[in-house]
Interface confidence: low
């Protein structure tokens, strides 16, 4: 046996050379460079100005790269989607050298991380998608995508996060790998949109007059911009936009003795308008005098008999339906009749007398304006 000394030169973290001398008692059996660097990994760095890649060889030693130039274990000026062959050697290993095929990825600017969230769902969902914005010749089968959002990891080109909290910030990191080598990455912080406001709390909702009603409420908890108050009577619907500071609204010009259904919701104008749940209430306005009967006719059926008819009022304004007829001669009330319909047969009147016929509608609470006609009986023909 004889002594053999070998020297290894490595770079320290400061960049200065460190020479270590190892004395071995036997003839060393160095590995082949092909074996030593069998599992070498590579990172690709992209230069946006030159649009060329640099391949960074993940080795500890300063290796030699055969016919290619290596600087600090980096191979420069590699064209996207083109293969380059690098012959790696080092004095710590023997021939044959490691032949490394650099499969250069596509240019970084050919990919764009795009927010694909639908505006309608932007309050509770996030969608992120890598888009190919230019063509390239690399095999797309060799491209893989990875996303990490919080503790969730996805191996997809597009991700959709659902059931998120409105108005919250979420961070997602993503990277693209080509033949399992990362060549670009991006991070996005996305704030979910304003959510739908909550439901306002109606405190009271009532009518204390024939033409008016009032509604008061507490605002919802979540952010909102304004209120919409709708009131529906039968099939008619009217809606109003109300300022966010309001907590009370007086409804005017309502129809008497009518049921109104009210709905109140808050809304927010975010990426789209989002309406909160509507709070509902209803009231019936008080009665009021009915309008006048119309198309009243008085016709003679015989010498001393009259037939009085009229059409119902346009607005009844109350719960009941009753027609009244008052017949006066001079200032004396001679008849006072009440029917379900406006159809009166007045008999046994004095002949050759002037009569005043007053017909009006009564709704159970109020009488209406009378419709007045004058008519005379004739001189008896018998």
């Amino acid at each position: 046996a004889y002594l053999n000394a070998s020297e290894t030169t490595t770079l320290s973290p400061s960049g200065s050379a460190v020479i270590s001398t190892t004395t071995i008692a036997t003839t060393p059996s160095k590995p082949t460079c092909d074996e030593k660097y069998a599992n070498i990994t590579v990172d690709y760095l992209y230069n946006k100005e030159t649009k060329l890649f640099t391949a960074k060889l993940n080795v500890n030693e300063n290796v030699e790269c055969g016919n290619n130039t290596c600087t600090n274990n980096e191979v420069h000026n590699l064209t996207e989607c083109k293969n380059a062959s690098v012959s790696i050697s080092h004095n710590s290993c023997t021939a044959p050298d490691k032949t490394l095929i650099l499969d250069v990825p596509p240019g970084v600017e050919k990919f764009q991380l795009h927010d694909c969230t639908q505006v309608e769902k932007a309050d509770t969902t996030i969608c992120l998608k890598w888009k190919n914005i230019e063509t390239f010749t690399c095999d797309t089968q060799n491209i893989t995508y990875r996303f990490q959002c919080g503790n969730m990891i996805f191996d997809n080109k597009e991700i959709k996060l659902e059931n998120l909290e409105p108005e919250h910030e979420y961070k997602c990191d993503s990277e693209i790998l080509y033949n399992n080598h990362k060549f670009t990455n991006a991070s996005k912080i996305i704030k979910t949109d304003f959510g739908s406001p909550g439901e306002p709390q109606i405190i009271f909702c009532r009518s204390e007059a024939a033409h008016q009603g009032v509604i008061t409420w507490n605002p919802p908890q979540r952010s909102f911009h304004n209120f919409t108050l709708c009131y529906i009577k039968e099939t008619e619907k009217d809606c109003l936009n109300l300022d966010k500071n309001l907590i009370k609204y007086d409804l005017q010009n309502l129809k008497p003795y009518t049921k109104y259904v009210l709905s109140l919701h808050a809304y927010i104008i975010a990426k789209v308008q989002r309406n909160g749940s509507a709070a509902m209430c209803h009231f019936t306005t008080k009665s009021a005098p009915p309008s006048q009967v119309w198309n009243m006719t008085v016709s003679m059926t015989s010498d001393n008999s009259m037939h009085v008819k009229c059409r119902p009022p346009r607005d009844r304004n109350g719960p009941h339906e009753r027609y009244h007829l008052e017949v006066e001669a001079g200032n004396t009330l001679v008849r006072n009749e009440s029917h379900k319909n406006c159809d009166f047969r007045v008999k046994d009147l004095q002949y050759s007398t002037d009569y005043t016929f007053k017909a009006y509608f009564h709704n159970g609470d109020y009488p209406g304006e009378p419709f007045i006609l004058h008519h005379s009986t004739s001189y008896n023909s018998k």
Epitope: P219, H225, D243, K244, N245, L246, I247
Partner: antibody, heavy 119, light 106 residues
Framework: EVQLVESGGDLVQPGRSLKLSCVAS????????MTWIRQVPGKGLEWVAS????????YYPDSVKDRFTISRDNAKNTLFLQMNSLRSEDTATYYC????????????WGQGTSVTVSS | DIQMTQSPSFLSASVGDRVTIICKAS??????LDWYQQKLGEAPKLLIY???NLHTGIPSRFSGSGSGTDYTLTISSLQPEDVATYFC????????FGGGTKLELK
Amino acid sequence: EVQLVESGGDLVQPGRSLKLSCVASGFTFNNYWMTWIRQVPGKGLEWVASISSSGGSIYYPDSVKDRFTISRDNAKNTLFLQMNSLRSEDTATYYCARLYYYSGGGDAWGQGTSVTVSS
Amino acid sequence: DIQMTQSPSFLSASVGDRVTIICKASQDINKYLDWYQQKLGEAPKLLIYNTNNLHTGIPSRFSGSGSGTDYTLTISSLQPEDVATYFCLQHISRWTFGGGTKLELK
């Protein structure tokens, strides 16, 4: 640029009246609630009156209720404050402000007009 | 009426200090609280609306927080130009200002 310019401040005797004006420019006046706020020199701020965009809703604190009247002329982009039965405690700088759409506070203020009530 | 109690009424701090101003409401105001800055001889300026939303153009060293009856304005690193009086305003029911905090440099 949003601008609010107040005018009408003066020295008046107690019991007299004064009308303040505030001309708005640089924004759609009839879309915003407006408000008057006053400040006694070296003291805090006190809300005086607020009016909705259409003029349909008006609010006052008890200290000025029945004495002050807020109004607006949307065609002329002008806000008014009619002050009657003035008292010495009404002495202050009066600011008009636009109420911020996303909140109830003023996001744009005028430079103020000075009202002094003294005999 | 809702009362707003602001503290402290006077505050002296050094450049770079973290400064905190507190407003207490006499009842729950549901985050309807704004903060204003008023420099000498100027009109007040909106800093923060609805508790924690920074108004356009306001530096990010200003922040707001709170809920219920207790609200806070924080200046993370005091700058010379922050010397001013600060007011809070509740607007859930009518409008009430706090008494103000005069902030000076040590």
